[in-house]
Each structure stands twice: as C-alpha cells, then as structure tokens.
Interface confidence: low
C-alpha cells in the first residue's frame, strides 16, 4: 500500500509547528526540496526547514527528559520519603533513649544527675551526629561517657567525704577507670552493641541517600545530539511528509531507546546489586544490629554497669586511694 | 512491636485487643521499603520499554513510521532503523556512558561493597560470638560479676524491637520529654536482659 500523498500546502504542518514555536515563520508555504536538512532527509518534497529540524531536536530531547522524569517519579518519591522518615525516626529513637537514660539516673542516682545529664546529652548528641555521617569514633564516644561518669560516681557515691572534685583527681580517676576496668566489661559490651547498630544505621541512611542521588542523576541526564537526532527522526520526521497522525513502529522505538539509553542501562547491574545488598543489610538489622533495640535498652546496661561499680566499691576505693593518693594529697593541702 | 490507636481500636464496636493485624515497627517499615524497592529492581533495564510504552507508538494501527517511511506494522522494515547511512546505533553504544553516569556507577559500586561488608552473615546473629559479647543469657564467663543477667531485681523477657520500659519517670528538665515513657516489643527473636529499673508490670 503506497503512502498517502504529502500535504500539498504544508498547512497542517504549520498549524502543528505553531504550537511548538508560536509566531515563527519557519514552515515553508508549500513543500520544498529540503536539501539543507540533516536529520529528516527527504525522499521527495518536504514541509520542513533546517530551523524546524533544530526545534524538533530540542523538543525531542526535552520530551525524553520529561518521560524519564515521569518514569522515575514513583521510585524517587519512595526513596526520598523513606530517607526522611527513617532519619526522623532515628532522631526520635535517640531522643527517647537519652530521656530513658536521664530518667534512670534521676530515679536511681539523683546525686549524679546534674553532671550525668550533661555527659549523657553529649553522648547522644555524638550518636546523632555519627548516624548523620560525622567522623566520630564510637569507641571514643563510649569511653568518654564512662571516663566522665566515673569521677562523679567516685566523688559523689563511693567517697562522698572528698572535697569538691578538683581536676587533678578527676584526671587520675579517668585514667584509673580504664586501668582498673572499674565498670567490668560493660563499656566493651556497649561499644560492641552501639558501634554495630550505629554503623548499620548509618550505612542504611547513606544507602538511601545514594539511591536518591542515583535517581536524580538519571533524572537530569542531558541526552546526546546523536540521541536527539534519532528521537527527532522517530517522533517528528513523519510530519515533514505531512503524515501528522502516524506513530512510530514499536520495534523501532525500542531500538532507538536502547541506543539513547545505552549508558543509563549500564547502571542496571549495580542498581540490582544495590537493592539486593540493601535487603541483606535490612534482614540483619535486629538485636545488636538494630539501633532502636540497642539504644532504647542502653539505660539498663548503664544502670547495671553502675551497680557493678557499687558492688566492687570497697575494693575499688582502696585501690584508687593508693593510685590517686598523690592527687588527693594535693587536694587536701 | 509498635502499637498505635488505629490498630488497637480499629473496630469501635469490638475492641480488637487480642489480634492486631498490623503491628508495624521501624523494622517492618524497613522490610516494607525493601519489598517496594524490589518491585523497581528492573527499573534501569526496563526504562527503554517503559518510555516507548509511554510515548506515542503504533499499537493498533496497520501502518507505522520507521524513521524514513510509512510501513506495515508487522513488516521487517518496521523494526529497522531508517536511514542507516546517517549514523549507527552500534556506534552510539560504543561511546560508553556519560561521565555523570560513570560517576554514579562508581558510587553504587562503593556503597554495594559497604553494604555487603556490613550485612550480617546468615546465622551470625545467633552464633557463639554474641554470647562472648554478653548478649545471650547462657554462659557468663568465669566472673559472674560481669554477667549482664546477674544484676537487678528480676529477669524480664525483652523482645526485639521496642522494649517496654516502665516507670522510669519523674519530670525531667531535660530535652523535650519526660522519661516516664513506655514502648512496645516484638514477638520474635527473644533475648533476655535484666531490667532493675522501676516497676515492671
């Protein structure tokens, strides 16, 4: 079946092109040879000009970008929404964990509260910062918490007769805390639990944020001129022949799209791996790999660690008395 | 797990306290996210097809455009790229991905490596290494003093996810919430930890 004859006057082509580029007189009145065309190479007379071709290429690339954005809209929203939800959720968990820990001190060790609140606050601030990607060492955070707590426990509970704590004895007590393992293996336990759960939480958030970056990158891809030419030929060159209602062949479209998206499709392998690796991570996020579980139970372990100090109070006071005697003498003078 | 009013009291006539169908928590939210993400696992390989199906393509028409001429939809010419002399599709592919795409691929490789190293190997969470970390209620080592389960007034079963804390309380002039807060627990993966704080119900 031969193709229908082209529009003898280019009238239809003009009215369509006016919608793309209002007010411009780039459409020939009647079909022309079109020898200057580079994309829509005519087999006979054409209703397209070089300027029109350029406009079609621009429009085709814009269409492609919009199609790509609409393709990724649902996925993009899913990851953006979840990244925000989880970030806020983790902040809420940290806030509650801090409040539980403070409540434990207020309930059980009121004499420690003012300073304990301060140290607990600093610890959980660091926890939040770590989750958000800060370059903080979890072991240092835990050590700092126990280093800070011990002088207060010693001067307020174990040896309340001492004068107001002076930096000298505090420094000695901080050192003794580690040397004598005054909290037993609790600091090590907390380090293990907190570092494992926070590492996983942090990488989970990082992964979600990278997911957003991946979608954003492909969302805003600028397609090459070659791709623009292929798209133009597929979507608009038929208009030059006055064939306004005809659509591209399905197989042809697939070939063109694969050509245009050859680079993007290379992401596929790594994207699949990303989702499967994220699934594996999520499946393992329980017990000590679940920050909600670990942080909300921290008050209990800290409470147990202080009880451990109290239980060994007698032995410790004697040992520390000798170990920090020099600092104490300087205090009493 | 995490409970909320819509679950607890869905039916105003019958108090559905015993069987809550959606006991959702952060972990179930994570799993839900993964399930949704998995439906996008072929996203990039399916893009060309998606875009063709969302742009004008001849479906029911007898004739279609192959870039050069009008042809019958099922003819060999229909799939062929018209005007091959213009430029070659194969050449276009050979150029390789744009720099931004290469960059994002590198970032994906990096995060995938991190995710794999961070993932808990199957069975790891239940193995002996956790006992050594003091999490299980079995052996506590030679020094009973250091056994986590040995201090406190009573042992309470604590289930994974949100633990119920009771009466931690009294108004705190700290941050934004009183410490006297309660939170849920999940049925599976039980571990035992002692809680000697407050009155556990």
């Amino acid at each position: 079946q031969p193709p229908p004859p082209p529009d003898a006057t280019c009238h239809q082509v003009r009215s369509f092109f006016q919608r793309l580029q209002p007010g411009l007189k780039w459409v020939p009145e009647t079909p022309v040879p079109g020898s200057d065309l580079q994309v829509c190479l005519p087999k006979g007379p054409t209703c397209c000009s070089r300027k029109m071709e350029e406009k079609y290429q621009l429009t085709a690339r814009l269409n492609m970008e919009q199609l790509l954005q609409s393709a990724s809209m649902e996925l993009k929203f899913l990851i953006i929404q979840n990244a925000a939800v989880f970030q806020e959720a983790f902040e809420i968990v940290v806030r509650h964990a801090k409040n539980y820990t403070n409540a434990m001190f207020k309930n059980n060790y009121p004499s420690l509260t003012p300073q304990a609140f301060e140290f607990v606050g600093e610890f959980f601030t660091d926890v939040s910062l770590y989750i958000l990607g800060s370059d903080i060492n979890v072991d240092d955070m835990v050590n700092e918490l126990f280093d800070s707590l011990f002088p207060v426990i010693y001067t307020q509970m174990m040896n309340p007769g001492l004068p107001e704590s002076v930096l000298d004895i505090n420094e000695c007590l901080r050192g003794a805390r580690r040397d004598l393992k005054v909290f037993g293996s609790f600091p090590k336990l907390i380090m293990t639990q907190v570092s494992k759960s926070l590492q996983v939480t942090r990488i989970f958030l990082q992964a979600l944020n990278l997911g957003i970056e991946v979608i954003n990158t492909t969302d805003h891809l600028k397609f090459s001129k070659d791709c623009g030419r292929m798209l133009t030929r597929m979507w608009y060159c038929s208009y030059c022949q006055g064939l306004m209602m005809v659509k591209p062949c399905g197989g042809y479209c697939n070939v063109v799209m694969q050509g245009c998206m050859a680079g993007v499709v290379e992401i596929d392998k790594y994207w699949r791996e990303y989702i499967l690796s994220l699934e594996e991570l999520v499946n393992g996020m329980y017990r000590i790999y679940d920050m909600e579980n670990v942080l909300l139970g921290l008050f209990s372990t800290i409470h147990d660690s202080i009880q451990y100090v109290q239980k060994n109070g007698g032995k410790l006071t004697t040992t520390i008395g000798k170990l920090c005697a020099h600092s104490q003498q300087r205090q009493y003078r | 797990s995490a409970y909320y009013p819509e679950d607890l009291f869905i039916d105003k006539k019958i108090l559905k306290v015993a069987h809550v169908e959606h006991e959702e928590t952060l972990s179930s939210r994570r799993r839900e996210l993964i399930q949704k993400l998995k439906s996008f696992i072929n996203f990039y390989s399916a893009l060309p097809g998606y875009i063709c199906s969302h742009s004008p393509v001849a479906e029911n028409d007898t004739l279609c455009w192959n870039g050069q001429e009008l042809v019958e939809r099922y003819s060999q010419k229909a799939a062929r790229n018209g005007m091959k002399n213009q430029f070659n599709l194969h050449e276009l592919k050979m150029k390789g991905p744009e720099p931004v795409v290469s960059q994002i691929i590198d970032k994906l490789k990096h995060i995938n490596q991190l995710l794999r190293t961070m993932s808990v190997p199957k069975g790891k969470v239940l193995d002996k290494s956790l006992d050594e970390e003091g999490l299980e209620s079995g052996d506590c080592g030679d020094d009973e003093d250091e056994c986590i389960g040995s201090s406190g007034d009573g042992m309470v079963k604590v289930k994974n996810q949100l633990r119920f804390l009771a009466e931690l309380a009294y108004d705190l002039d700290v941050d934004d919430a009183p410490g006297n807060k309660q939170h849920g627990n999940q049925k599976d993966n039980e571990i035992t930890t002692s809680h000697s704080v407050g009155n556990m119900p």
């Epitope: 806020e88 959720a89 809420i92 806030r95 509650h96 | 797990s1 995490a2 409970y3 909320y4 009013p5 819509e6 607890l8 009291f9 105003k12 019958i14 108090l15 306290v17 015993a18 069987h19 809550v20 959606h22 959702e24 928590t25 952060l26 179930s28 939210r29 949100l162 119920f164 009771a166 934004d176 919430a177 009183p178 006297n180 807060k181 309660q182 939170h183 849920g184 627990n185 009155n199 119900p201």
Partner: antibody, heavy 120, light 105 residues
Framework: EVQLVQSGAEVKKPGASVKVSCKAS????????ISWVRQAPGQGLEWMGW????????NYAQKLQGRVTMTTDTSTSTAYMELRSLRSDDTAVYYC??????????????????WGQGTT | DVVMTQSPLSLPVTPGEPASISCRSS???????????LDWYLQKPGQSPQLLIY???NRASGVPDRFSGSGSGTDFTLKISRVEAEDVGVYYC??????FGQGTK
C-alpha cells in the same frame, strides 16, 4: 516547662461550627499526639478523638464521626479541633491533652500526661 | 462500645486512711503485647484532669507513690495507701484512647 495553652471561651448558636486551638510548648510537638476530651456541665469526661502531630493520622470517637475534624499545624506547634452542626448538648469544657506518638510504624503509649486549661 | 463501670461512685475517706476504687470493663483490655490499656485520671475541683496511672500499673511522672494501679483483663483497681486532703476530686478510669468510666468522687 511542658504546657498546652487553649484558645478562649466561645458562645455559638445551634447549627454553627466551632474551632478550638491548642498551642504546645516545651517539647518537640511532632514526637507526640494530641487527644481531645470534653466535659459537659456536672458530667464526666468524654474522649472525642486523637491526632498524631507526626503525620496527621486521626482516630475519632464513633459518636462524633462526621462532625469532628482534628488537624495540626507543625510550624506553630498547634492542634485544632473543629466541631460542626453544634447542638445544645455540645455545651462543655473542651480539653486538649498530649498523648502518644503514632504513625503507621512507630508508637509509644504514654497516657494523656499533659492537659490544656480547657475551653468553655 | 466498651463500657467502663466504676464503683463506688462516691467514696468518703478520712485523711490517713487507705482508699480503693474499682473499674470493670465490658471487654478485656489486655493487649497481645502483655499490657493492659487502662489509665487512671484525677480531676481536682476546678482543674483540668491529670494522669495518675497508665497501662494499668505504671505511675505517671510526678505522681506520689501512695497511688498504685493493679488488675488485668477486665478488673482493675486504683489504691491510695494513705489518703491526703489534696487527693480530693473525681477519679476516672479510661480504656486507653477510647472510653472513660463515669467517675468516682
């Protein structure tokens, strides 16, 4: 100090609508929910409904379904309760109270631990 | 709807004496998580209500330890070990986030 401050007394004719506000301060508004409770003169307390300040989820008492709408404005840490088609038996003191936080995956139940001063 | 029934409706008590209020629900308030979704509130004359006990037996922040809650399923009790003059008011039990009892004065 954690507190909820409600809008002033209102006088309305039958059939009209009323919108009571409840401004929260001293805590993170979106970490909790808000319940509304009313008390007719000389009567007991009646729970009207609940809204999550985190995501706007609501749960209304069946008796008021269709007449009551609860909303929040997180930018001003304010909760609102609107009651439409007022009847004479809606005459009451209306209280807002801080309640548990909820979204579809995260819920801590605290009881209604902080109350507003009431709006007549 | 679940019906909450309190008894007695009025309870005259001398300061220093113990007091006990009972609350019965028409259906079990015991959730599968092991907690009873029942709260106790006190409304002092001319004041807003205040939370005393939540989830059956948990004393709220700042509530004196002379107040205690007990019970499970459908039967609950609020006890005051030694009543003080400031404890005067109306006590309400509440099925969490749903229905109040009629109050005990």
């Amino acid at each position: 100090e954690v507190q909820l401050v409600q809008s002033g007394a209102e006088v309305k004719k039958p059939g009209a609508s009323v919108k009571v506000s409840c401004k929260a301060s001293g805590y993170t508004f979106t970490s909790y929910g808000i319940s509304w409770v009313r008390q007719a003169p000389g009567q007991g307390l009646e729970w009207m409904g609940w809204i999550s300040a985190y995501n706007g989820n609501t749960n209304y008492a069946q008796k008021l379904q269709g007449r009551v709408t609860m909303t929040t404005d997180t930018s001003t840490s304010t909760a609102y309760m609107e009651l439409r088609s007022l009847r004479s038996d809606d005459t009451a003191v209306y209280y807002c109270a801080r309640d548990g936080l909820s979204s579809s995956w995260f819920y801590y139940y605290y009881g209604m631990d902080v109350w507003g001063q009431g709006t007549t | 709807d679940v019906v909450m029934t309190q008894s007695p409706l009025s309870l005259p008590v001398t300061p220093g004496e113990p007091a006990s209020i009972s609350c019965r629900s028409s259906q079990s308030l015991l959730h599968s998580n092991g907690y009873n979704y029942l709260d106790w509130y006190l409304q002092k004359p001319g004041q807003s209500p205040q939370l005393l006990i939540y989830l059956g037996s948990n004393r709220a922040s700042g509530v004196p330890d002379r107040f205690s809650g007990s019970g499970s399923g459908t039967d609950f009790t609020l006890k005051i070990s030694r009543v003080e003059a400031e404890d005067v008011g109306v006590y309400y039990c509440m099925q969490a986030l749903q229905t109040f009892g009629q109050g005990t004065k």
